[in-house]
Interface confidence: low
């Protein structure tokens, strides 16, 4: 039995190419250290986008990634995808494992469904 | 108020099992994981294991491996410890134990298992 | 397994007398994720064990603030600074750092 993983199901990302949104866990089970991975599904394939680990000391994660960001607080992780592009549309999954204390813990989220328009090119001035 | 109520002292003869309760009460019972502490007579203390009473996921101590198996009752809030093919030197006080950001934040009162013929 | 030795097996002191109670790990319990899982625990006679410390320097809850906690990698200390009556009894160390975990021998603290 794994621990529940929650993430909303549709989210639109910005203008700038930003998709934000949270992803939480439960129980809590006062976890000392949680690594969280961003998987992105497509057809039957799963790609690790990036991948963290938060401790009570570390609550900003994905230093190594700059396209990802992230802020761990207790049972929930906000994270924030930048440099998207209309071609990663796609479903990205939210997987959870909770390292210390032990007995180990994994959960994945049902994913959500990233939907990224580009930006229309300004037309041309006159001026 | 969070607290372990543990069972009765046990006479046993050697070669027999026994298994002994942790009744918690004042918290959520599958949100914390639960410790078993051995302590011989005048002597110090050792971990067991822990077990996840969420999902009954158990992390060992090598040497109790075989000797010591863990199980919950979630509808009861109660977690259980086994003891095989008892010997003398199984004989101690063990204490539950759980966790809140320290390994034994809180204990059970212990049970006394007696191992003679 | 990690040993966690407390040379000192039976300590005594005076009322009102600070008190140094010492912890050496046989490795460093420093924890992959940056924590050391160092826990100090108090057992009267008759009694289960209670929590002083955690994480090498964190009292518990209504643990008086005489008690602290020091030290890093493989020596840790745990102070008294005035020894009231009630503080009397075994003092445990114990690592949560690697399994198996494990507890020091004990601090014996009485009254001189």
């Known amino acids: 039995e794994a621990i529940q993983v929650t993430q909303p199901s549709v989210v639109l990302a910005s203008s700038h190419g930003v998709a934000s949104f949270p992803c939480e866990y439960s129980p809590s089970h006062n976890t000392d250290e949680v690594r969280v991975t961003v998987l992105r599904q497509t057809n039957d394939q799963m790609t690790e986008v990036c991948a963290t680990t938060f401790t009570e000391k570390n609550t900003v994660g994905f230093l190594d990634y700059p396209f990802c960001s992230g802020t761990f607080n207790e049972s929930r992780v906000n994270l924030t995808i930048q440099g998207l592009r209309a071609v990663d549309t796609g479903l990205y999954l939210c997987k959870v494992e909770l390292m210390y204390p032990p007995p180990y813990f994994v959960g994945m989220g049902n994913g959500t469904q990233i939907y990224v328009i580009d930006p229309e090119p300004c037309p041309d001035s006159d001026f | 108020e969070a607290k372990l109520q543990e069972s009765g002292p046990v006479l046993v003869k050697p070669g027999a099992s026994v298994k002994m309760s942790c009744k918690a009460s004042g918290y959520t019972f599958t949100d914390y994981y639960m410790n078993w502490v051995k302590q011989s007579h005048g002597k110090s203390l050792e971990w067991i294991g822990v077990?996840?009473?969420?999902?009954?996921?158990?992390s060992y101590n090598q040497k109790f491996k075989g000797k010591a198996t863990l199980t919950v009752d979630k509808s009861s809030s109660t977690a259980y410890m086994e003891l095989n093919s008892l010997t003398s030197e199984d004989s101690a006080v063990y204490y539950c134990?759980?966790?809140?950001?320290?390994?034994?934040?809180?204990w059970g009162q212990g049970t006394l298992i007696t191992v003679s013929t | 397994d990690i040993v966690m030795t407390q040379t000192t097996l039976s300590l005594p002191v005076s009322l009102g007398d600070q008190a140094s109670i010492s912890c050496r790990s046989s490795q460093s319990i420093v924890h992959s994720n940056g924590n050391t899982y160092l826990e100090w625990y108090l057992q009267k006679p008759g009694q289960s064990p209670k929590l002083l410390i955690y994480?090498?320097?964190n009292r518990f809850s209504g643990v008086p603030d005489r008690f602290s906690g020091s030290g890093s990698g493989t020596d840790f200390t745990l102070k008294i600074s005035r020894v009231e009556a009630e503080d009397l009894g075994v003092y445990y160390c114990?690592?949560?750092?690697?399994?198996?975990?494990?507890f020091g021998g004990g601090t014996k603290l009485e009254i001189k």
């Open positions: 077990i996840n009473p969420y999902n009954g996921d158990t």
């Open positions: 134990a759980r966790y809140y950001g320290s390994w034994f934040a809180y």
């Open positions: 114990f690592q949560g750092s690697h399994v198996p975990y494990t």
């Open positions: 994480k090498v320097s």
